[in-house]
């Protein structure tokens, strides 16, 4: 089927702290060192980013007509295209989750479709042909999913909510940012 763009806008997916992924157990080594468990204070400058939206996994809303040969839908349909970053390597305070953040390289995420919806459309055809109904599958939401050593890019691993662990050890340094700093930024993807 062909698509004709009509208009688009964007929604950003910026997960809350509880949604920060814990890399699957089989991908982490057995050392107990990690930032949330060991209660380090949130760092300031180096881990902050000025524009959170610059790195978010975006849901771009496209309004399109469905076409099939010479036939075209009577009304446009709106669907999402997943785009942008799942989060930068530059992390926000308190947004580290249980990842081994001090490593120079880490888990890779992708912004891809999460849920789909089916929509019935009516196709109008030229030359007086009878309209026909057709069901199309449209992207309903986007999500960051991890590439793992056991998955290729077409089999991406989901991450789900994770309860933030109570912190122990050092007391956090006062945060320089506002509420937006609570929003977790995930690993970088493209």
């Amino acid at each position: 089927q062909g698509w004709q763009a009509f208009k688009n806008d964007a929604t950003e997916i910026i997960p809350e702290l509880g949604e920060y992924p814990e890399p699957p157990p089989e991908l982490e080594n057995n050392k107990t060192m990690n930032r949330a468990e060991n209660g380090g204070r949130p760092p300031h400058h180096p881990f902050e980013t000025k524009d959170v939206s610059e790195y978010s996994c975006r849901e771009l809303h496209f309004t399109r007509y469905v076409t099939d040969g010479q036939c075209r839908s009577a009304k446009p349909v709106t669907e999402l295209v997943c785009s942008g970053q799942c989060g930068p390597a530059r992390l926000l305070p308190n947004a580290i989750g249980r990842g081994k953040w001090w490593r120079p390289s880490g888990p890779d995420f992708r912004c891809i479709p999460d849920r789909y919806r089916a929509q019935r459309v009516q196709l109008l055809c030229p030359g007086g042909a009878a309209p026909r109904a057709r069901k199309v599958r449209l992207v309903a939401s986007c999500k960051c999913k991890r590439l793992t050593r056991f998955h290729n890019q077409s089999e991406l691993k989901d991450f789900g909510p994770e309860a933030a662990r109570p912190q122990k050890g050092r007391k956090p340094r006062p945060r320089a940012r506002g509420a937006k700093a609570n929003q977790a930024e995930l690993e970088n993807a493209y």
């Epitope: 991908l27 080594n29 057995n30 050392k31 107990t32 060192m33 990690n34 930032r35 060991n38 380090g40 760092p43 300031h44 400058h45 180096p46 881990f47 930068p88 390597a89 530059r90 992390l91 580290i96 990842g99 081994k100 953040w101 001090w102 490593r103 120079p104 390289s105 880490g106 888990p107 890779d108 991890r146 590439l147 793992t148 050593r149 056991f150 998955h151 290729n152 050890g169 690993e187 970088n188 993807a189 493209y190």
Partner: antibody, heavy 119, light 111 residues
Framework: EVQLVESGGGLVQPGRSLRLSCAAS????????LHWVRQAPGKGLEWVSG????????DYADSVKGRFTISRDNAKNSLYLQMNSLRVEDTALYYC????????????WGQGTTVTVSS | QSVLTQPPSASGTPGQRVTISCSGS????????VNWYQQLPGTAPKLLIY???QRPSGVPDRFSGSKSGTSASLAISGLQSEDEADYYC????????????FGGGTKLTVL
């Protein structure tokens, strides 16, 4: 200016020990993860070890595990590498490097200190 | 032998576009982000690309990174004489207890 300066290299016999130091300036030291990377003469880069801001946030390359110990002293803005049971194959230029972003590569490097292990 | 495989050499003329490949496996490039470093003769390495395709401030946009499956690439467009250097890819490797692995390096010659 962000700066890392390594010291402590030299000529040492196989089986002996050496301690490398890295002095940092120009940035908030304990916000950085720090690493040692070495480069044998005419060869490529080899990561040796890395540390977060606490002593339980540590990784080692298999080739040095059990022989080398990485540590840091945030009060002194210093990183250390204690190298024991040195081998001829440990001969290299040792760089101190840091990353200011989680999973964001080593974005600060020193100029290196040379370790030569030879009898 | 390096865990990540790079061609030992590459070359191009000024203004040309050159691509350097880096091949790994599912335990490194396949699941983790890739970084690229430039090492000019007689100097310390410099971070060129982090997290597959992100440029640190100060790195010209002539340099770009990409990743697909278990391979990554560094592209340099509008090649300049000062780009003559060794280039290294690197990624975390999840096998065993894990380590940060580098490619063997690619010597880029500007003809």
């Amino acid at each position: 200016e962000v700066q890392l300066v390594e010291s402590g290299g030299g000529l040492v016999q196989p089986g002996r020990s050496l301690r490398l130091s890295c002095a940092a300036s120009g940035f908030t030291f304990d916000d950085y993860a720090l690493h040692w990377v070495r480069q044998a003469p005419g060869k490529g880069l080899e990561w040796v070890s890395g540390i977060g801001w606490e002593d339980d946030m540590i990784d080692y390359a298999d080739s040095v595990k059990g022989r080398f110990t990485i540590s840091r002293d945030n009060a002194k803005n210093s990183l250390y590498l204690q190298m024991n049971s040195l081998r001829v194959e440990d001969t290299a230029l040792y760089y101190c490097a840091g990353n200011s972003r989680g999973y964001g590569g080593l974005d600060v490097w020193g100029q290196g200190t040379t370790v030569t292990v030879s009898s | 032998q390096s865990v990540l495989t790079q061609p030992p050499s590459a070359s191009g003329t000024p203004g040309q576009r050159v691509t350097i490949s880096c091949s790994g496996s599912s335990s490194n490039i396949g699941g983790n982000t890739v970084n690229w470093y430039q090492q000019l003769p007689g100097t310390a390495p410099k971070l060129l690309i982090y997290s597959n395709n992100q440029r640190p401030s100060g790195v010209p946009d002539r340099f770009s990174g990409s990743k697909s499956g278990t391979s990554a690439s560094l592209a340099i467009s509008g090649l300049q004489s000062e780009d003559e250097a060794d280039y290294y890819c690197a990624a975390w490797d999840d096998s065993l207890e894990g380590s940060y692995v580098f490619g063997g390096g690619t010597k880029l010659t500007v003809l």
